[in-house]
């Protein structure tokens, strides 16, 4: 008789999830000498321990504590780039500007990027059929709690000037319900962070509007100011040129506004 299995609304665990996490860990520790001491089997065991045999709607930040400890990695606090709804460009930027870091440039972020995972209560099985959707099922699911945990800690670590890349093509350029808006903004430490600088990335070629005047950006400015952190905003009118100028800052066309 086939065992009854909970049907969730979201996609199931990414195929070959254990192998993928382990392989990513090995690759990361080979590329980053400062993380060579990391035992990837222990990392996988801690990752697995956070969600296996637990109800996938009842995961807590504490479940990820052992993994957080094993993945400890000091990030230069003044070189942090946050992003919201514009991951690809943020990652392209840090691939060029190698001294800046997004969360996905850390071991923990790299391990989990674009993956889905969940288990089942009281069985050691990984659920490859379906996992809880944040909206339709529950917010305390393994994936959401992981990203909330690492995002909070990443924001907590930031100091001096923190940059955030925002998508100017979205109806809500700043979205209070995004990870940036609901977690990271509220965990910047005013004792350490002087300024949050938003880079609003324009989508259209002929878009010359000042998106820093957008009502949602004004809302972000208000939230940040109330936390005693200064706020500044820049329009990135031409993201392609922006990246090109990060690569080749001496280029004569890079002195004008981008």
């Amino acid at each position: 008789v086939p065992r009854w299995r909970q049907q969730w609304s979201g996609p199931g665990t990414t195929k070959r999830f254990p192998e993928t996490v382990l392989a990513r860990c090995v690759k990361y520790t080979e590329i980053h000498p400062e993380m060579r001491h990391v035992d990837c089997q222990s990392v996988w065991d801690a990752f697995k321990g956070a969600f296996i045999s637990k109800h996938p709607c009842n995961i807590t930040e504490e479940d990820y504590q052992p993994l957080m400890k094993l993945g400890t990695q000091t990030v230069p606090c003044n070189k942090i780039l946050l992003w919201s709804r514009i991951k690809d460009l943020a990652h392209q930027f840090t691939q060029v500007q190698r001294d800046m870091f997004t969360l996905e440039d850390t071991l923990l972020g790299y391990l989990a990027d674009d993956l889905t995972w969940c288990g089942e209560f009281n069985t050691s099985k990984i659920n490859y059929q379906s996992c809880p959707d944040w909206r339709k099922d529950c917010s305390n699911n393994p994936v959401s709690v992981f990203w909330k945990t690492v995002s909070r800690r990443f924001a907590e670590a930031a100091c001096d000037v923190v940059h955030v890349m925002l998508n100017g093509s979205r109806s809500k350029i700043f979205d209070k319900n995004s990870t940036f808006g609901s977690v990271e903004v509220h965990n910047l430490q005013p004792e350490k962070v002087q300024t949050l600088e938003a880079w609003v990335i324009h989508g259209g070629r002929e878009d010359s509007r000042d998106l820093c005047q957008d009502p949602t950006i004004k809302e972000l400015e208000s939230i940040i100011s109330k936390r005693n952190i200064q706020f500044s905003c820049k329009n990135i009118y031409r993201p392609d040129k922006f990246l090109q100028c990060v690569k080749n800052p001496e280029d004569s066309s890079c002195t004008s506004e981008i």
């Epitope: 504490e62 504590q65 400890k69 400890t72 000091t74 990443f154 670590a157 430490q189």
Partner: nanobody, 116 residues
């Protein structure tokens, strides 16, 4: 400059009590997971007690029911109340601050000796 300064160690008789304190400077203590470790001569450093930034505690089996870890984020201190001390608790006790992305820091240690 980050500093963790332990205090409160000393010589105590078996069955007695001590309260260790760790004062942090140069870090925002509230975001760190804090721990007390100890190292006896010729032995490995071992975790005694820990408290997460969220306030959850855990203890080594050998000290459960006898030791209590607590934190005061406003004062930037973490304490370890040690009751019913035994000779096996003799060691140098170290304070540890650990944050996934903000670094790991250690104090210099304070000696605890339990002897009659």
């Amino acid at each position: 400059q980050v500093q963790l300064q332990e205090s409160g160690g000393g010589l105590v008789q078996p069955g007695g009590s001590l309260r260790l304190s760790c004062a942090a400077s140069g870090i925002i203590l509230r975001i760190y997971d804090m721990g007390w470790y100890r190292q006896a001569p010729g032995k490995q450093r071992e975790l005694v007690a820990a408290i997460t930034s969220g306030g959850r505690t855990n203890y080594a089996d050998s000290v459960k029911g006898r030791f209590t870890i607590s934190r005061d984020n406003a004062e930037n201190t973490v304490s370890l109340q040690m009751n019913s001390l035994k000779s096996g608790d003799t060691a140098v006790y170290y304070c540890n601050a650990d944050h996934t992305f903000a670094g790991v820091y250690w104090g210099q240690g304070t000696q605890v000796t339990v002897s009659s």
